[in-house]
C-alpha cells in the first residue's frame, strides 16, 4: 500500500497567490483529515471529512481556506489569497 499521497511536496508562492494542496487517501479509508503544523502553534486540525462530507472545519475559520472532497479518493485544500503566516507543513491523513 502506498499510504496517503500528497502533492506537491514543496510549494513556494508569493503573498496573495492561490495555493492548492492535493491528497489521495488510503483506499478504503472513509475519513480524511487536513492538519497544519508550525513552530508557533503546533499541530492544528483544519478540517476532517467522513464519507466525503465535511464534519468539522472549525480549525479554518478564515474563508481564505477551503477544502473539498469530491470523491472517496481525492481531496484538495485551497488557500486564496495566501499570506506569509500560512507558511507551514500541511499534512493529510486518512483512517477507517
Amino acid at each position: 500500500d502506498a499510504g496517503v499521497i500528497q502533492s506537491p511536496r514543496h510549494e513556494v508562492t508569493e503573498m496573495g497567490q492561490e495555493v492548492t494542496l492535493r491528497c489521495k487517501p488510503i483506499s478504503g479509508h472513509n475519513s480524511l483529515f487536513w492538519y497544519r503544523q508550525t513552530m508557533m502553534r503546533g499541530l492544528e486540525l483544519l478540517i476532517y471529512f467522513n464519507n466525503n462530507v465535511p464534519i468539522d472545519d472549525s480549525g479554518m475559520p478564515e474563508d481564505r481556506f477551503s477544502a473539498k472532497m469530491p470523491n472517496a479518493s481525492f481531496s484538495t485544500l485551497k488557500i486564496q489569497p495566501s499570506e506569509p503566516r500560512d507558511s507551514a507543513v500541511y499534512f493529510c491523513a486518512s483512517s477507517l
Partner: antibody, heavy 117, light 106 residues
Framework: EVQLVESGGGLVQPGGSLRLSCAAS????????MHWVRQAPGKGLEWVSY????????YYADTLKGRFTISRDNSKNTLYLQMNSLRAEDTAVYYC??????????WGQGTTVTVSS | DNQLTQSPSFLSASVGDRVTITCRAS?????IYWYQQKPGKAPKLLIY???NLAPGVPSRFSGSGSGNEYTLTISSLQPEDFATYYC?????????FGQGTKLEIK
C-alpha cells in the same frame, strides 16, 4: 433549539479580572468553533476571540492579545473568556456566538462588564 | 487589519422604500457577512457568503458584491427592518466588523 447563555459579567475595578462563561445547549457543542464579540455602550460590534472545536486553533484581536484568554470545556458544553488587567475601555456587553455558515449564526443575549473604580 | 467602512452610517427611509447599504474593505475579501441588530438585543445573522440568506430571513433582503465592495439591499422596507446593520469579514483574522449603519424611520 440552539441556546447560548452568557454569565460572569459585573462591576470590576481597573486592573481586576473576570471570567465570563457561555453555556451552550441544543446542538453538539464539541463540533463547533465559538467566538466572543463585545459592544461598548453606544458603539459598534468588536470581534474579540475565536476557538476551534478542539481548542487547537485560537485567534485574538490584536489589541487584546496577552490580557484575554479563550478556552472551552466540551464535557460541560461551556465556553470561557478569562479577562485580566481590565481597563475602562473593556466596559461592554460581551456576546458569545457559534460559528456557522462561515459566520456567527447564533448569539447569546450578552453579559455586561463594567470596569470602573 | 482589514478595515471595513459602511456607508451611510445613518439612513432615514420610509416603509416601502428600497434601501442599499455599502460595505467597503481596505483589502480585498472573499465574502462579506451581514447582521441586523435591534436595540438591547443580540445581533442576528442575515446574509452569509455574500449573498446567501440565513434561515428565516425574508427574501426582501439580498446581498451582492466582490473584491472590496459589497452591498446589502432591502427591496421594500418593513417596520421591523428599522435597526442597525453590520458587515463582517472572515477572510483573514482579525475578523473585523464595519462600524454599522443605523436605519431610521423618516
Amino acid at each position: 433549539e440552539v441556546q447560548l447563555v452568557e454569565s460572569g459579567g459585573g462591576l470590576v475595578q481597573p486592573g481586576g479580572s473576570l471570567r465570563l462563561s457561555c453555556a451552550a445547549s441544543g446542538f453538539t457543542f464539541s463540533n463547533f468553533g465559538m467566538h466572543w464579540v463585545r459592544q461598548a455602550p453606544g458603539k459598534g460590534l468588536e470581534w474579540v476571540s475565536y476557538i476551534s472545536s478542539g481548542s487547537k486553533t485560537i485567534y485574538y484581536a490584536d489589541t487584546l492579545k496577552g490580557r484575554f484568554t479563550i478556552s472551552r470545556d466540551n464535557s460541560k458544553n461551556t465556553l470561557y473568556l478569562q479577562m485580566n488587567s481590565l481597563r475602562a475601555e473593556d466596559t461592554a456587553v460581551y456576546y458569545c456566538a457559534r460559528r456557522g455558515e462561515g459566520a456567527m449564526d447564533y448569539w447569546g443575549q450578552g453579559t455586561t462588564v463594567t470596569v470602573s473604580s | 487589519d482589514n478595515q471595513l467602512t459602511q456607508s451611510p452610517s445613518f439612513l432615514s427611509a420610509s416603509v416601502g422604500d428600497r434601501v442599499t447599504i455599502t460595505c467597503r474593505a481596505s483589502s480585498s475579501v472573499n465574502y462579506i457577512y451581514w447582521y441586523q441588530q435591534k436595540p438591547g438585543k443580540a445581533p442576528k445573522l442575515l446574509i452569509y457568503y455574500t449573498s446567501n440568506l440565513a434561515p428565516g430571513v425574508p427574501s426582501r433582503f439580498s446581498g451582492s458584491g466582490s473584491g472590496n465592495e459589497y452591498t446589502l439591499t432591502i427591496s421594500s422596507l418593513q417596520p421591523e427592518d428599522f435597526a442597525t446593520y453590520y458587515c463582517q469579514q472572515f477572510t483573514s483574522s482579525p475578523f473585523t466588523f464595519g462600524q454599522g449603519t443605523k436605519l431610521e424611520i423618516k
